[in-house]
Interface confidence: medium
């Protein structure tokens, strides 16, 4: 079995998590991709996903989460803006490939959000503000209902993260396995 590894991001409240998930270009470029949170002993919960098929360089926003799939570079960009302490937890990118199980992209992200704004070590204040200038999407992306049982064979360290979006149309506090991307007009 492939060893599951984590990479750690320590950020302050209000900052932006800005990460990339690399994938095999030819194989997965147009596949639907998702951002998930993994809670202790539970199945991964999908927080946001791209459209199906995934569009090139087309931002999809779910509350404070923005996904952008760069087909030409073989990477999915994930941003979580205006981070809150409650966002702390373990996250992963997956590629949906029905009827097969989702393909997990390495490595998992251990996000630690602490109180008090500081410009480091994440994106600086300007880039945190800029994130809201992304043109809103007018499409709905439906995230598949299933998650992979394989990804929880070994319970990760406990995380108490609840992703909440106080300033947006969608509240992710009580996340179910399916999340519909709202239409932003």
């Amino acid at each position: 079995a492939t060893k599951l590894t984590e990479e750690k991001y320590e950020l302050k409240e209000g900052q932006t998590l800005d990460v990339k998930c690399d994938y095999t270009l030819e194989k997965f470029a147009s596949s639907q991709k998702a951002w998930q949170i993994i809670r202790d002993g539970e199945m991964p919960k999908t927080l946001a996903c791209t459209e199906r098929p995934s569009k090139n360089s087309h931002p999809v926003q779910v509350g404070r989460i923005i996904l952008e799939d760069y087909h030409d570079h073989g990477l999915l960009r994930v941003r979580m803006v205006n981070l809150q302490v409650e966002d702390s937890g373990l996250y992963q990118c997956v590629i949906y490939q029905p009827p097969k199980e989702p393909h997990m992209l390495f490595d998992r992200i251990r996000l630690v959000v602490t109180k008090g704004f500081s410009g480091t070590p994440g994106s600086n204040e300007n880039s945190t503000q800029n994130v809201y200038k992304i043109p809103p999407t007018t499409t709905k992306a439906l995230c598949p209902l299933y998650t992979s049982p394989r990804t929880v064979t070994q319970a990760p360290p406990k995380s108490t993260a609840d992703v909440s979006t106080p300033d947006s149309e969608i509240n992710l506090t009580n996340v179910t396995d399916i999340i519909r991307v709202p239409v932003f007009n």
Epitope: E7, E10, K20, T120
Partner: antibody
Amino acid sequence: QVQLVQSGAEVKKPGSSVKVSCKASGGTFSIYVISWVRQAPGQGLEWMGGIIPLFGTANYAQQFQDRVTITADESTRTAYMELNSLKSEDTAVYYCARGHGPGSSHYSYYGLDVWGQGTTVTVSS
Amino acid sequence: DIQMTQSPTSLSASVGDRVTITCRASQGISSWLAWYQQKPGKAPKSLIYAASSLQSGVPSRFSGSGSGTDFTLTISSLQPEDFATYYCQQYNSYPLTFGGGTKVEIK
């Protein structure tokens, strides 16, 4: 094979600014992390910050946050590091270095595997 | 920030000697550790990544080990071109941090 070529040595007055460039030739530029590392005379290595050119957002070490700006121009495959309010303690060799993460990472799975030749910045009145 | 402590700060050795340099992280960094070699007036050169993986083109006499907080760089048989300063660096989390360096000198 990727190469990073940096701009030439600079002599600056205290209080002024310096902008060092780092041009990549060969290989992919956009999705690699370009970090800036400095080394004062006789001292160790100090990471200042880094950027993924495709994203355009930079990360900075806290001690440089207020004075440094890291940018990148995808069209010319060049990264820049601008340091403001220069002090004599900023006299150092400044290196750019490349990293690449195959996982969900801003930072380098392989460490900093390709380095520029270094740019000497001397701050003196 | 994660502090990286290298030891010794300097050592004297002869050609053919086995040399060991250690690096300790102030908190666990899994295997996210790299080792670099730097010669006077030159840019650092990457030797080891992910604690134990040899960078392409690096001689096999260099090896790395460890995980968590304690790491080791070993040169199995020191060669004349190996006299240099060696640095460890963590990339478990931002900001990336380096050890203070170990200078390997000729005895």
